[in-house]
Amino acid sequence: LPAQVAFTPYAPEPGSTCRLREYYDQTAQMCCSKCSPGQHAKVFCTKTSDTVCDSCEDSTYTQLWNWVPECLSCGSRCSSDQVETQACTREQNRICTCRPGWYCALSKQEGCRLCAPLRKCRPGFGVARPGTETSDVVCKPCAPGTFSNTTSSTDICRPHQICNVVAIPGNASMDAVCTSTSPTRSMAPGAVHLPQPVSTRSQHTQPTPEPSTAPSTSFLLPMGPSPPAEGSTGD
């Protein structure tokens, strides 16, 4: 005959563990039912009565089978620089991600706690490393023979046009200006040194370079004093 199915609460056999979706209550010394996601333990079990579960209140949740006395608070509402990609429900926390043009500067277990705008490289500087969801743009000075005349988080340094006769030499923030004869544009975007006669190469004023390890504004895992505690608000 099959073994009789035990109903919670029950005393486990010595050395055995409680079944799936059950927990061992130290006070009652019994295996008791866990509460389902979206619920919490309102009354803990005794030797004679099982766990009493209740639904999470508004703006609180439990994601797992549990026996917590209170549901967890949903995170604070998404800020204006964020997009809510998952709403706060009784079974899941709110998830905020950064809107386009921004990156996650301080991550949390799920989603993002702090977004910051992608850095814009000023004229004379181009993008050395593009931004991602979790890292900022890195800018670099435009090398001789290249320029950027924009303030942009996406534009790289582009090669100066090659002139038959130069009217105004290019520099880090301005393209060369040719005389009325047609220029020939270099076909190697991002090229640093262009094969051109010395007499026609545009002059370049090198800007003061940033440190070789160019700065980035991502601040993912705080390593010094902790970041401020996260706020929590209801809907």
């Epitope: 890292s135 940033e210 991502s218 895992l221 010094g224």
Partner: nanobody, 118 residues
Framework: HVQLVESGGGSVQAGGSLRLSCAAS????????MSWVRQAPGKGLEWVSA???????NYSDSVKGRFTISKDNAKNTLYLQMNSLKPEDTAMYYC????????????WGQGTQVTVSS
């Protein structure tokens, strides 16, 4: 011992001005770049402004044209000049330092409270 200590917060009427300071010690100021972040009561963190090693700066839309970030490398101090303050600027303001070439906020201050009444 690394420290970032903010000061200059306080209570002000809407339209008024405040200047926040953040004194840094225990690390090479010029090897980091600095940022201001704020947290309004019951809300999440909001990025405000950053200043980079080449002294270029960046601002959130909500403060652009009203706030100015600056730094004094000789004094190891970061500043935030806040003009035309609005009630929605009420928050705890934190300065933070990011080591150049990394993708991590390395150090945070303890914050200074700014309260703007209408």
């Amino acid at each position: 011992h690394v420290q970032l200590v903010e000061s200059g917060g306080g209570s002000v009427q809407a339209g008024g001005s405040l200047r926040l300071s953040c004194a840094a010690s225990g690390f090479t100021f010029s090897s980091y770049y600095m940022s201001w972040v704020r947290q309004a009561p019951g809300k999440g963190l909001e990025w405000v402004s950053a200043i980079y090693s080449d002294d270029s700066d960046n601002y959130s839309d909500s403060v652009k044209g009203r706030f100015t970030i600056s730094k004094d490398n000789a004094k190891n101090t970061l500043y935030l000049q806040m003009n035309s303050l609005k009630p929605e600027d009420t928050a705890m303001y934190y300065c933070a330092a990011i080591r150049i070439g990394t993708d991590q906020y390395k150090f945070w201050g303890q914050g200074t409270q700014v309260t703007v009444s209408s």
